[in-house]
Interface confidence: medium
Amino acid sequence: HGTELPSPPSVWFEAEFFHHILHWTPIPNQSESTCYEVALLRYGIESWNSISNCSQTLSYDLTAVTLDLYHSNGYRARVRAVDGSRHSNWTVTNTRFSVDEVTLTVGSVNLEIHNGFILGKIQLPRPKMAPANDTYESIFSHFREYEIAIRKVPGNFTFTHKKVKHENFSLLTSGEVGEFCVQVKPSVASRSNKGMWSKEECISLTRQYFTVTN
């Protein structure tokens, strides 16, 4: 009975800061009663814990049971299909889920105009699930960087990409008029984590902000 069902073809994590989601692809020809069992293994404690006996979705939020991710050696997860009394073999994640797999994001970007500059402030993510002491800046305490992309509207091609090494940055507006849109992508220079571009924040410059600087 144990191997009558095919296994999920693939299982993987997609994670942002304290938002750790396990995904899998469905088995072929699954029925309306097919569901999926999820189990989790923490490196250093070599036993599998059952997390969900019967998930009918193709993803599962494991944040609550992986809150120590940023202080651990990581996790593996496995998923199998279940249909009544039948179940498939387990499909295990190909890679260790560790802090390195977390995609870095920002909370938001705030823009304001002051003395001829657009002042940008990058708000770091503050997920509700994160323990009080586990802030973005405490976990990634050094070498935080942010790539800044600026688009002039209308303008169909030029982005300016620069890196800043602080959560605050300034854009010189003198002599410029129009709408400017800014996106930010975080990184940590000492780490290999991917970063995700923030949503665009835009601000309009008019002649009233005109100043000359040298």
Partner: nanobody, 124 residues
Framework: DLQLVESGGGLVQPGGSLRLSCAAS????????IDWFRQAPGKEREGVSC????????TYADSVKGRFTISRDNAKNTVYLQMNSLKPEDTAVYYC?????????????????WGQGTQVTVSS
Amino acid sequence: DLQLVESGGGLVQPGGSLRLSCAASGFTLDSYAIDWFRQAPGKEREGVSCISSSGISTTYADSVKGRFTISRDNAKNTVYLQMNSLKPEDTAVYYCAAAALCMSGTYYAGPGYWGQGTQVTVSS
């Protein structure tokens, strides 16, 4: 094809001068700020100077203030960097880049519309 081309580099003695040019083809520079930046061997790329699209506003790195002057001729679709009182530490490849705005307190990361660079060597 969108392209920026730098020229005017060369070998010059300490205290000498050079004038770098940044010319655009395939698009007009007058809608964009222009950055000059440089990269010396084994060092990070650093911003040198930036000029706003109108040409009214300019910024300079502390290391070149009073010695370098940035200007633009939108009719010729060209931006210039006049470099006086050159020092050996100015030796680098100099690049220009089209920008939406000048940015302060940052270094250029790319990618973007920037050229292949022109070598400036200051040596006696």
